[in-house]
């Protein structure tokens, strides 16, 4: 029987009865907040073999092992995770061992076993046999291993029953409890599962099977389950569902889940029955069950109840995140703010259509309107008094409307009005008239030629670059010396540069009037020698990175026919040279036979160029004779090693006062003082633990149902 869509057992241990007939839990299983210690021995759920999402255990008093509850739990698929984890065991005060001796596979996600004061048999489980990658596992704050004395079956009698594997260079027996070994399949099975008798399962089986080489005898399926059979793909007219089974169209059409109740129902896309069309797709009609690709960003219509939406802060802009069509009017009134241009672009950058008017007034923080980077149509269905559908008044720092070389904007109805924008050149406004199709609609007073652009360099000459030289972290550029009509008007140059992975940046990107600017700025004085071309060395750059660079001449505000003359260059794109890559990450090695090592790693975080190959070097190390000096099968306390690695838990460093001299045979050394890097790592670790704990509490503490 499939149980779902997630089972939450809390407060009363008798709720466990809900699991009685479940073979698969389609969703998560929470067992938590049972504060009264109970006797769980009468509760046993041998039918449960698969959890499709995650298993979470939290503060269940009296529960000492999971093995009796779930003796046949074989697979946790991790289709959805709890904060990246498929198995979470947290603050289980009485848990002595995990004991899930039939758990063979956690398909996705890591494990988090934390703050379980009595929990042992953690170091005896080889999680790499269950998970693909163990590097994200978090096993912290449980009973210290040296207090556990974990012994696998038969070890005391010197007839060990369990198999051995290597973890962290330690070759040891693997078991779940004092009487349950960790099951391993014969190497002849390869990646396949096996029966209790070590016969290989069918390749479509996952975890285990009741008969060899039979796709109807699997305990769980590697890919999908359909009509009693494990299949590599869902048959025709059936669709993947929840990552593990095949369902028909009717099932998909009828799903009404608490999570998706507000949507228009599940959809079928790319052979899968899913809650919503994936990113980049939209329903083929409002009640359709099928998805089609969006042309550009997927449409999202947003409407303002009061007809006019005032954008006076980042918070108000946030309401428009993801909107592509805004039904109503936009009133933009941004007087101040931090990093305002990029914040506005983040929240309003997808708007393509405004059905009413757009009014920008007293927005002294704005330098450009490029944050509305996808606006292509103002319908003007509603207009301001005087029939204006685009109204720009008193914006003290507005210099650019949009980059008209890369912008098509249509104003379908209504006129434009511009006044008291002292840094906005009239030529910029005239250009907008042409692009938007409003030329001829405005009357003489609608675009004021006296108080728009009165404090701007509106007649610009072009500065030309003369040379560029690059190294791995430097760029040297020079440009023609600019000669204004009166040479005394030229004060200096300003070079603007920034990383630009794509050749699509504009001068006003991320720039606002409150100091935020995505461009780095460097001032360059005029060379004293009139024949030397000005130039600059930009250093401290990243290797193999494309930068955008432009130069502006800083001139005196010389008025010529009521306009100031200035000069600037085009934007130049230039890439630094390649360099040595940073070190490969997460290097792991494991032995899979007596003559082989398997080494895995992730690419470097900074490739600094196009990676073409890796070099792997290895060398033989002498065997550590120390390993043979103690009988590890005896239950005596294992001797403390004669060196410290500087990572001992604080609470464990109590035995050795700091007066002991290190070295020789004088006894254990003291822990060395922590380096700054170690302190920082510890700080981050503590922070991470806090974040997880907050996430856990926020997720599971909910108001009591009615």
């Amino acid at each position: 029987e499939i149980c779902g869509p997630g089972i939450d057992i809390r407060n009363d241990y008798q709720q466990l009865k809900r699991l009685e007939n479940c073979t698969v839990i389609e969703g998560y299983l929470h067992i938590l907040l049972i504060s009264k210690a109970e006797d769980y021995r009468s509760y046993r759920f041998p039918k449960l073999t698969v959890i499709t999402e995650y298993l979470l255990l939290f503060r269940v008093a009296g529960l000492e092992s999971l093995g009796d509850l779930f003796p046949n739990l074989t697979v946790i698929r991790g289709w959805k995770l709890f904060y990246n984890y498929a198995l979470v065991i947290f603050e289980m005060t009485n848990l002595k061992d995990i004991g899930l001796y039939n758990l063979r596979n956690i398909t996705r996600g890591a494990i988090r076993i934390e703050k379980n004061a009595d929990l042992c048999y953690l170091s005896t489980v080889d999680w790499s046999l269950i998970l693909d990658a163990v590097s994200n596992n978090y096993i912290v704050g449980n009973k210290p291993p040296k207090e556990c004395g974990d012994l696998c079956p038969g070890t005391m009698e010197e007839k060990p029953m369990c198999e051995k594997t290597t973890i962290n260079n330690e070759y040891n027996y693997r078991c779940w409890t004092t009487n349950r070994c960790q099951k391993m399949c014969p190497s002849t099975c390869g990646k396949r599962a096996c029966t209790e008798n070590n016969e290989c399962c069918h390749p479509e089986c996952l975890g285990s099977c009741s008969a060899p080489d039979n796709d109807t005898a699997c305990v769980a399926c590697r890919h999908y389950y359909y009509a009693g059979v494990c299949v590599p793909a869902c048959p025709p007219n059936t669709y993947r569902f929840e990552g593990w089974r095949c369902v028909d169209r009717d099932f998909c059409a009828n799903i009404l889940s608490a999570e998706s109740s507000d949507s228009e129902g599940f959809v079928i896309h790319d052979g899968e029955c899913m809650q919503e069309c994936p990113s980049g797709f939209i329903r083929n009609g409002s009640q359709s069950m099928y998805c089609i690709p969006c042309e550009g960003p997927c449409p999202k219509v947003c409407e303002e109840e009061k007809k006019t939406k005032t954008i006076d802060s980042v918070t108000s802009a946030q309401m428009l995140q993801g909107c592509t069509i805004f039904k109503g009017n936009l009133l933009i009134n941004i007087r101040r703010g931090n990093n305002i241009a990029s914040e506005l672009e983040n929240f309003m950058g997808l708007i393509e259509v405004v059905t009413g008017y757009v009014k920008i007034r007293h927005s002294h923080a704005l330098v450009s309107l490029s944050f509305l980077k996808n606006l292509r149509l103002i319908l003007g269905e509603e207009q301001l008094e005087g029939n204006y559908s685009f109204y720009v008044l008193d914006n003290q720092n507005l210099q650019q409307l949009w980059d008209w070389d890369h912008r098509n904007l249509t104003i379908k109805a209504g006129k434009m009005y511009f006044a008291f924008n002292p840094k906005l050149c009239v030529s910029e406004i005239y250009r907008m008239e042409e692009v938007t199709g409003t030329k001829g609609r405005q009357s003489k007073g609608d675009i004021n030629t006296r108080n728009n652009g009165e404090r701007a360099s509106c007649e610009s000459d072009v500065l030309h670059f003369t040379s560029t030289t690059t190294s791995k972290n430097r760029i040297i550029i020079t440009w023609h010396r600019y000669r204004p009509p009166d040479y005394r008007d030229l004060i200096s140059f300003t070079v603007y540069y920034k990383e630009a992975p794509f050749k699509n940046v504009t001068e006003y990107d991320g720039q606002d009037a409150c100091g935020s600017n995505s461009w780095n700025m460097v001032d360059v004085d005029l060379p004293p020698n009139k024949d030397v071309e000005p130039g600059i060395l930009l250093h401290g750059l990243k290797p193999w990175t494309q930068y955008a660079v432009y130069v502006k001449a800083v001139t005196l505000t010389m008025v010529e026919n009521d306009h100031i003359r200035g000069a600037k260059s085009e934007i130049l794109y230039i890439r630094t040279n390649a360099s040595v890559p940073s070190i490969p990450l997460d290097v792991l090695s494991a032995s899979n036979s007596s003559s082989q090592l398997i080494v895995k790693w992730n690419p470097p975080s900074l490739p600094n160029g196009n990676l073409s190959y890796y070099i792997v070097r290895w060398q033989r190390q002498p065997q550590d004779g120390y390993l043979y000096r103690h009988n590890y099968c005896s239950k005596d306390k294992i001797p403390i090693r004669k060196y410290a690695d500087g990572t001992i838990d604080i609470e464990e460093v109590t035995e050795n006062p700091k007066t002991e001299v290190c070295g020789g045979e004088k006894g254990p050394c003291c822990a060395c003082p922590k380096t700054e890097a170690e302190k920082q790592a510890e700080k981050e670790e503590a922070e991470y633990r806090k974040v997880f704990e907050n996430f856990l509490h926020n997720s599971i503490f909910v108001p009591r149902p009615e």
Epitope: E1, I2, C3, G4, P5, G6, I7, D8, R18, N21, C22, G27, F251, A253, N254, I255, L256, S257, A258, E259, S260, S261, E264, G265, S286, Q287, P705, E706
Partner: antibody, heavy 117, light 112 residues
Framework: QVQLQESGPGLVKPSETLSLTCTVS?????????WNWIRQPPGKGLEWIGY???????NYKPSLKDRVTISRDTSKNQFSLKLSSVTAADTAVYYC??????????WGQGTLVTVSS | DIVMTQSPLSLPVTPGEPASISCRSS???????????HQWYLQKPGQSPQLLIY???NRLYGVPDRFSGSGSGTDFTLKISRVEAEDVGVYYC?????????FGQGTKVEIK
């Protein structure tokens, strides 16, 4: 895999309250869907009584609204029907059923309730 | 309440012959979202009802293709192209577009 099972007294006296419980296995009643009661008087057609949704909201047939209450016990994964002031006309087979976005997909096997003194 | 009226109320059929049942609603059962939540259920003797057709014409997976549904607005039809002995029972139409949800009074199909 989802199963619904009605339970309750088969005989109720006139003017008393009829109480039935539907136990659901294989799906959590808070996880989604609308959980319905439907009845069928002997030899007659089906009549929808009302539902309780996954979030606890109710909808009842207006002509029965004053007498009917559908509630739930999430810890037991059950929902219940209470019909007050019953008469002989309330004698019927009572079904519990699950309704999704479009149709009833699972039904209980039904339980006969007779109203008689 | 929307009244669903079925006809005929009794339908004697010969195996292998076609059959048709009509269902008329007292007002349009098109939901505000554009869908028509009209279904046909079959109740075999001593059993709970089982779904045959949903949203007017969608045949449930596993239902034989001799069953088909059609109609719109207020008039709906269930057709059985060739009746088989296992098709006997009471057929109900149902509307779930407007609360209160309502069933038709049922059409009893029996073998002649």
């Amino acid at each position: 895999q989802v199963q619904l099972q009605e339970s309750g007294p088969g005989l109720v006296k006139p003017s008393e309250t009829l109480s039935l419980t539907c136990t659901v296995s294989g799906y959590s009643i808070t996880g989604g869907y609308l959980w319905n009661w439907i009845r069928q008087p002997p030899g007659k057609g089906l009549e929808w009584i009302g539902y309780i949704s996954y979030d606890g909201t109710n909808n009842y047939k207006p002509s029965l609204k004053d007498r009917v209450t559908i509630s739930r016990d999430t810890s037991k994964n059950q929902f219940s029907l209470k019909l007050s002031s019953v008469t002989a006309a309330d004698t019927a087979v009572y079904y519990c059923a699950r309704y999704g976005r479009v149709f009833f997909d699972y039904w209980g096997q039904g339980t006969l309730v007779t109203v008689s003194s | 309440d929307i009244v669903m009226t079925q006809s005929p109320l009794s339908l004697p059929v010969t195996p292998g012959e076609p059959a048709s049942i009509s269902c008329r609603s007292s007002q349009s059962i098109v939901h505000s979202n554009g869908n028509t939540y009209h279904q046909w259920y079959l109740q075999k003797p001593g059993q709970s009802p089982q779904l045959l057709i949903y949203k007017v014409s969608n045949r449930l997976y596993g239902v034989p293709d001799r069953f088909s549904g059609s109609g719109s607005g207020t008039d709906f039809t269930l057709k059985i192209s060739r009746v088989e002995a296992e098709d006997v029972g009471v057929y109900y139409c149902f509307q779930g577009s407007h609360v209160p949800w309502t069933f038709g009074q049922g059409t009893k199909v029996e073998i002649k």
